[in-house]
Interface confidence: low
Amino acid sequence: PEPPTACREKQYLINSQCCSLCQPGQKLVSDCTEFTETECLPCGESEFLDTWNRETHCHQHKYCDPNLGLRVQQKGTSETDTICTCEEGWHCTSEACESCVLHRSCSPGFGVKQIATGVSDTICEPCPVGFFSNVSSAFEKCHPWTSCETKDLVVQQAGTNKTDVVCGPQDRLRA
């Protein structure tokens, strides 16, 4: 018969014959022959291959480097790579999550609109009129100005986006 020019799914063409690919989690040791099947071996402890393949070496699992703020989210298997994520309080600097950065803080005059997650940074917003923030914080929202009226006091010093109002006693009219 004519030698094949194409092979079925999960096969590959070598030396004019179709050999079975190695299944995920295994690497190729030797190609098939007219008389023998493809020989495959399982990947080692910290290795993986995630597709049907003819690779002679497995890939190393990703290392989640704690010095980059990373930790293991999902341990790798012989068929899957390790998935890294950031330590609590940090978020990935890229989609591949190769390193992390500490969540940023919102400066005075700004409050936290959205608290950071493992993949997104803190979102800050300017404190609108009637609100203030006098600290740099990764968690605090803008606080409303104190209502002097509800305390039977008057505004002695107006508030800003960074400072609260200062309340003081009402001037008593003398009889």
Epitope: N67, L68, G69, G89, W90, S99, C100, V101, L102, H103, R104, S105, S107, P108, V135, S136, S137, A138, F139, E140
Partner: nanobody
């Protein structure tokens, strides 16, 4: 000019305690995230701990969790690292750094203080 000056290092027995301080100047300390890193003899830098500007977020490497406590006094422009239950493997030069990345990419570094844990 930004300056970071660590102090408090020394020789301590295993199981003992030390408190490191880092005096900061030349920038608005209360607006800056701060980090402690260390370098053991003949080894690379290791991130130890970090703290948010207001101290409302503190973070630790697994190797020191439950033993070390980071804190800060913004009124004194000072960062602290309380180290308890010290082990031989904690022997290192400890540096404070201004910045929010747990690697070498800090804005500014201190000169370091040596902690030796030995009996």
């Amino acid at each position: 000019e930004v300056q970071l000056l660590e102090s408090g290092g020394g020789l301590v027995q295993p199981g003992g305690s030390l408190r490191l301080s880092c005096a900061a100047s030349g920038f608005t300390f209360g607006d800056a995230a701060m980090t402690w890193v260390r370098q053991a003899p003949g080894k690379g830098l290791e991130w130890v701990s970090a703290i948010q500007p207001m101290g409302d977020g503190t973070y630790y490497a697994d190797s020191v969790k439950g033993r070390f406590t980071v804190s800060r006094d913004n009124s004194k422009n000072t960062l602290y690292l309380q180290m308890n239950s010290l082990r031989a493997e904690d022997t290192a030069v400890y540096y404070c750094a201004k910045g929010r990345i747990p690697t070498l990419q800090f804005d500014y570094w201190g000169q370091g203080t040596l902690v030796t844990v030995s009996s």
